[in-house]
Interface confidence: low
């Protein structure tokens, strides 16, 4: 089939200490390859302080997937989620203030 | 054009340290974490260890104790350093770019790799 | 660690055939395996990653299959190009390992 670029959501969750867990969920994508990883200033973050979900078929003959990772509140600003898919790519900033949604759909 | 090169000594004593140099053009360290692998004569890979775009590091346990892995990301530039060497140390050693999206990680470019003899 | 077996150290094929290499892992590895094939001169290629994906540039007659910790590596139709060692490796839990290769050679 066609590409079909991907739906890019960030989302913010407060937890304990101080430290709040970011959320990138990118849907509605194909084919099902895709890079979706979390910078801190620019620079990717490694392996083992990011967690991952499965590409996984959303029903409609696409796929979604998420990544997330824990930061300092306060800190938002610093992080972006870094989307590749099909040759395009796009950076996503973690929302700031009360709102809690970023969304974006590529094209 | 994604490539990566590593320049070594070739030869080194036993007991003396070994510094490998991968230098590498077309991505930015950054963005990429790079692995360190070797091959002794008529033997397998094994992975080493590597560094991570972050700098943060991974050792394989068995060497951790003599490993230290390094980078300079303004000179695309990424250091191994390996103590204590001893003639089973013997091996070409690669560097090769790790390239990860969700579940997948793989190393997708390889250096042509290095050959470092340890003798006296 | 994760122990990787290529029971097979060498085999030899006539061009044209299909050949079949496998790799055995000590636990389960979830499909979290990619096959690397190195040629005489030393140089090292990925294959296949994540078990059955097709890296890109690599020739259609390579693919791959397996779960838990059974996996193989098919070669369709054998041409010379092909003569190399190769590698299976898991990477489900640090360190990665490889398995000991397999050679294939011309009759």
């Known amino acids: 089939g066609s590409t079909v670029p991907p739906m890019v959501n960030v989302t913010c969750s407060e937890v304990s200490e101080g430290n709040i867990t970011v959320t990138c969920r990118a849907s509605s994508f194909y084919p099902r390859n895709i890079t979706l990883t979390w910078r801190q200033d620019g620079v990717s973050l490694s392996h083992n302080t990011q967690q991952w979900g499965d590409v996984l078929p959303d029903g409609n003959g696409t796929y979604q997937t998420w990544v997330a990772t824990r930061i300092r509140q306060g800190e938002e600003q610093r992080f972006t989620c870094y989307m590749e898919h099909s040759g395009n790519h796009g950076t996503h900033p973690v929302p700031s203030g009360n709102s809690h949604h970023h969304h974006h759909h590529h094209h | 054009q994604v490539q990566l090169k590593e320049s070594g000594p070739g030869l080194v004593a036993p007991s003396q340290s070994l510094s490998i140099t991968c230098t590498v053009s077309?991505?930015?360290?950054?963005?990429?974490?790079v692995n360190w692998v070797r091959q002794p004569p008529g033997k397998g890979l094994e992975w080493l260890g590597m560094?991570?775009?972050?700098?943060?590091?991974d050792y394989n346990s068995a060497l951790k104790s003599r490993l230290s892995i390094s980078k300079d990301n303004s000179k695309s530039q990424i250091f191994l350093k390996m103590n204590s060497l001893q003639t089973d140390d013997t091996a070409r050693y690669y560097c090769a770019r790790g390239a990860y999206y969700g579940k997948r990680w793989y190393f997708d470019v390889w250096g042509a790799g290095t050959t470092v003899t340890v003798s006296s | 660690d994760i122990q990787m077996t290529q029971t097979t150290s060498s085999l030899s094929a006539s061009l044209g055939d299909r050949v079949t290499i496998s790799c055995s892992a000590s636990?389960?590895?979830?499909?979290?395996l990619n096959w690397y094939q190195q040629k005489p001169d030393g140089t090292v290629k990925l294959l296949i990653y994540y078990t059955s994906s097709l890296h890109s540039g690599v020739p259609s007659r390579f693919s791959g299959s397996g779960s838990g910790t059974d996996y193989s590596l098919t070669i369709s139709n054998l041409e010379p190009e092909d003569i190399a060692t190769y590698y299976c490796?898991?990477?489900?839990?640090?360190?990665?390992?490889f398995g000991g290769g397999t050679k294939v050679e011309i009759k």
């Open positions: 636990q389960g590895i979830s499909n979290y």
């Open positions: 077309g991505f930015s360290l950054t963005g990429s974490g």
């Open positions: 490796q898991q990477y489900s839990k640090l360190p990665p390992t």
């Open positions: 560094i991570w775009g972050d700098g943060n590091t």
